[in-house]
């Protein structure tokens, strides 16, 4: 159970006075408060937010909140000069524009500063040529198109909706395709829920609206201009040429009204299969080109935003630990929205502020948490995890040294059907005890725990009677700290039913449609799913900020280290001859993974016997438990990526939404039979095994009895 | 406490030049810019431009491009107007003005007390 | 140029009197409007941004308000020290302009 030394409330009623104080009218107030104006990054509204809660963090009882700078790179479009695409006849007339803006919704109509939908950091440009439609723009959409149906994409304009893997993938994919535009648009199958209405009178995607959204590969690297270092007011920035990350060519996304005009008119291939197909009446033709009548026309993008080295700042909330105020638990999560940011980022935003106030009142009665919790409000995430990126730059060697724990809070809700998780393996046992101890919001498990409807609903795939908990990808603040730092991390929020709703994210995401009505009328009414969610951010930065002895099992990772071992593996004997050849074994993996898992399992015995009056010793055995993450930690990082370091888990290299398990192991295997050096690929393999194993091994032994 | 200072009152020949400095205190120099505006006698406010001390951007009146020149000093946070080949027309009180360096911007909040410049032969 | 025209150019009334000044754009700002308070030998000050966000010390009485391309600046209950002259500003784009000002006096 919780304890702390420094407390004048009894340590049992520590984090059930820290829960009961936890309000869902607060969350409800706090979200319509951040949620009337538009917050991008950059723009004087969002300081005035930085402002307002670094104010409100103090009056709640923070010991010391401070605003953090930096000069990063951001992309706006042109106010004068708007982003649009065309169809232009044989005469270059435009006889179909996009339109320029999305209509606002009902009560928005005279709010100024609303974005127009864009791709930020796309380049300028003015291209025009034949449409090619890629379906989902991911490899294996690539290679179909190449490799299968022999279609060219090369000096082709692309289509693709959104959806499945992030964004930026596409555009990546698409430019080693050889395209030289990208258009996305959201298909009604990806972002209509069918049975439900479109926004306002339900929580579907207009055919006006647009998600907006970075096309950024940054790899872990933040600000393009000053990967590794933080971009503060002396910094060394490169030229735009060296830039880490950007994009080469123009991309625009659109809505399917529009998306509707560009694809009736597609000619050339039948799509492959029915997967090709979306929700609208068109054919899903893949081109390249029009259609017969339409032959003569092509399509042409007008893209003029500009890059622009521009001030953030994240909002650092410190309440110092009574016993260890040298370790820190950091609740982070952020601030920038794309326009009204209903559900991202503010439900997660309004969570934060809610457990800030819950802490803060316990504070004001005398009580201090054992270690010390920060809590962030980050800015230009939306721009590529800026804010964050940079101050974990600037501050990484406190946090290398000092960090415990980053639980994650962007958006609190997705959907309403069940939890969400992902994190650690460290966490697994955290996150189960927690869950026990609270109620399930969800009707039909009234008087059940949480931990029993999150069973029902999404149950593990492999271990009955427990949850699934999924692994950390990318795409949101706990990247830095998790996959360079080494920093165990979490997330969690409610989500969708994902077997039912087959569409990706919700569907109004990064539109100007995410407002707070959406939430207060559609996804949670009395804020009952926000406030579990904020129970259980809340509740695990409470424990890991509060126990004695922190709340890690070493063992679930042992468990998952053997999982990963026996996928990759297999992945790799769907090669039998050539791992024959190049003589490629993964014994010294499995050898590791073994002993990693009798080295643990003698730690947890040490755990449970040692003295833990003894402070010296306490804090040993908690410094192994915290630099366990630390140790998956390879300091040249990823093949050409280096700043994804964690050798267990990186985004995956077509997704960045996605986590992979022993990734550079995965990429050395991914394609390797269209590999024009077999040999060279296979050492690569054989490289990424040795790799691997030896940071399992040098893991392992960090648990080892000291002496 | 935000401050912006100007400096004391100018008579000038036409034909002279006239530099106006806004000391500014009490917030980061470099987070905000500074617009300069003027008031002819008994007339209404006319923005003549800005700067960012931040980027080192310029934003100018057409009505002024070629004669105005807006520079600032970051280590002494101060902002400076110079304005050229002075006509008559050119006496009025001239103001310096914080406004945040972003994309979206609510124009100026702190206004300094204002320098009269008259030009007179 | 976007043009303000701000009326009444003056106006009497007295202290309790309800207030109205009223400018209006020649063409769409949205909402980047501000209103400005100016009294002798002293710096203007910014009362309202965003046609209607109250900027901090500024008193409740005052207020702001849109109506298509009109915007208004409304004192409840005039007091004493408002008897000043009052300007509109549009940022919404370069350059910015102002309304011709409306000066408030005792009746």
């Known amino acids: 159970k919780s304890s702390n030394e420094a407390t004048n409330i009894t340590p049992k009623h520590n984090m059930k006075a820290f829960l009961d104080e936890l309000k869902a009218e607060n969350i409800k107030k706090f979200l319509y408060n951040f949620t009337q104006i538009p917050h991008l990054a950059g723009t004087e509204q969002n300081f005035q937010l930085a402002k307002q809660i670094q104010s409100q963090w103090k009056e709640f009882g923070l010991d010391s909140v401070e605003l953090a700078h930096y000069d990063v790179l951001l992309s706006y479009p042109n106010k004068t000069h708007p982003n649009y695409i065309s169809i232009i006849n044989e005469d270059g007339n435009e006889i179909f524009n996009t339109s320029l803006f999305e209509p606002p919704p009902p009560g928005y109509e005279n709010v100024s500063d609303i974005v127009p939908p864009f791709s930020a950091f796309s380049p300028q440009g003015m291209p025009e040529g034949d449409l090619v439609y890629v379906n989902y723009a991911r490899t294996e959409d690539f290679f179909k198109l190449e490799r299968d149906m022999k279609i060219n994409c090369s000096g082709k304009i692309v289509i693709a909706r959104y959806g499945k893997v992030f964004r930026g993938n596409k555009v990546k994919n698409a430019q080693l395709a050889g395209a030289k535009g990208v258009i996305l648009y959201s298909d009604p199958a990806d972002y209509f829920a069918p049975g439900v209405k479109s926004y306002p009178d339900g929580w579907n995607l207009p055919g006006g609206g647009v998600q907006r959204g970075n096309i950024l590969n940054l790899n872990g690297a933040g600000d393009p201009l000053t990967p590794g270092y933080p971009a503060n007011e002396y910094a060394y920035r490169r030229g735009i040429a060296e830039a880490v990350g950007l994009p080469s060519i123009p991309v625009h996304p659109i809505g399917y009204y529009d998306a509707q005009k560009l694809l009736e008119k597609m000619g050339g291939s039948a799509p492959p299969d029915s997967s090709w197909r979306g929700s609208l009446k068109v054919p899903y033709n893949v081109g390249p080109g029009f259609t017969g009548n339409f032959s003569t026309q092509k399509v042409k993008m007008h893209i003029h935003s500009t890059n622009e080295v521009t001030r953030i700042y994240n909002v650092i909330g410190t309440l110092r630990g009574a016993v260890e105020p040298d370790r820190y638990v950091i609740l982070g999560g952020h601030r920038d929205s794309w326009v009204f940011g209903g559900i991202d980022p503010q439900s997660g935003a309004a969570v934060v502020h809610e457990i800030v106030r819950s802490f803060g009142t316990l504070k004001k009665e005398g009580w201090r948490p054992r270690r010390t919790i920060l809590f962030a409000s980050w800015d230009a995430e939306e721009f590529g995890l800026l804010g964050s990126t940079e101050w974990a730059e600037e501050n990484s060697r406190l946090l290398q040294e000092r960090g415990v724990a980053y639980i994650n809070a962007d958006s609190s809700i997705e959907g309403n059907y069940t939890l969400r998780v992902d994190c650690t393996p460290l966490m697994y046992s955290l996150v189960h005890n927690l869950t026990k101890e609270l109620k399930s919001p969800d009707e039909g498990f009234e008087g059940k725990s949480l931990y029993e409807s999150w069973t029902k609903k999404s149950p593990s795939p492999e271990f009955s009677g427990m949850p699934r908990i999924s692994k950390l990808g990318s795409g949101n603040d706990f990247e830095v700290f998790f996959q360079r730092l080494g920093i165990a991390s979490g997330r969690a929020r409610y989500t969708k039913n994902w077997e039912t709703n087959k569409f990706s994210g919700y569907p109004l995401y990064h539109s100007v449609y995410e407002t707070y009505e959406l939430v207060e009328k559609f996804y949670d009414p009395m804020f009952k799913y926000h406030l579990t969610v904020a129970q259980v951010r809340g509740g695990m930065v409470f424990e890991l900020a509060n126990s004695i002895v922190l709340p890690f099992d070493c063992r679930d990772y042992a468990v998952v280290l053997r999982k990963y071992a026996d996928k990759i593996y297999s992945i790799s004997m769907k090669h039998p001859q050539e791992m024959k050849t190049y003589s490629v074994s993964f014994d010294s993996l499995f050898s590791a993974v073994k002993n990693f898992t009798e080295i643990a399992s003698k730690f947890s015995e040490r755990l449970q016997d040692f003295d833990k009056s003894n402070p010296i010793v306490l804090r040993m055995m908690n410094d192994q438990l915290m630099f366990l993450e630390r140790a998956f930690i390879d300091p040249l990082g990823l093949p050409d990526r280096p700043f994804y370091r964690h050798v267990i888990y990186a985004p995956s290299s077509h997704n960045k939404y996605a986590g992979e398990s022993f990734p550079g192991i995965y990429d050395a295997l991914f394609d390797i039979e269209s590999k024009v050096d077999p040999s060279k690929a296979w050492g690569e393999v054989k490289r990424q095994i040795y790799v691997a194993a030896f940071t399992v091994q040098a893991a392992a032994e960090t648990l080892s009895e000291v002496a | 406490e935000v401050q912006l200072v100007q400096s004391g009152a100018e008579v000038k020949k036409p034909g002279a030049s006239v530099k106006v400095s806004c000391k500014a205190s009490?917030?980061?120099?470099?987070?905000?810019?500074i617009s300069w505006v003027r008031q002819a006698p008994g007339q209404g406010l006319e923005w003549m431009g800005e700067i960012f001390p931040r980027r080192g951007n310029t934003y100018y009146n057409e009505k002024f491009r070629g004669r105005v020149t807006m520079t600032t000093d970051k280590s002494t946070s101060t902002a400076y107007m110079e304005l050229r080949s002075l006509r008559s027309d050119d006496t009025a009180v001239y103001y310096c003005?914080?406004?945040?360096?972003?994309?979206?911007?609510?124009?100026?909040?702190?206004w300094g007390q204002g320098t009269t410049v008259t030009v007179s032969s | 140029d976007i043009q303000m025209t701000q009326s009444p150019s003056s106006l009497s009334a007295s202290v309790g009197d309800r207030v109205t000044i009223t400018c209006r754009a020649s063409?769409?700002?949205?909402?980047?409007l501000n209103w400005l308070q100016q009294k002798p030998g002293k710096a203007i000050k910014r009362l309202i941004y965003a046609t209607s966000s109250l900027d901090s010390g500024v008193p409740s009485r005052f207020s702001g308000s849109r109506s298509g391309t009109d915007y208004t600046l409304t004192i409840s209950s005039l007091q004493p020290e408002d008897f000043a002259t009052y300007y509109c500003?549009?940022?919404?784009?370069?350059?910015?302009?102002f309304g011709g000002g409306t000066k408030v006096e005792i009746k």
């Open positions: 063409q769409d700002i949205g909402s980047s």
């Open positions: 009490g917030y980061t120099f470099t987070s905000y810019g």
């Open positions: 003005a914080r406004v945040f360096d972003g994309y979206y911007n609510y124009a100026m909040d702190y």
């Open positions: 500003l549009q940022y919404a784009s370069s350059p910015y302009t």
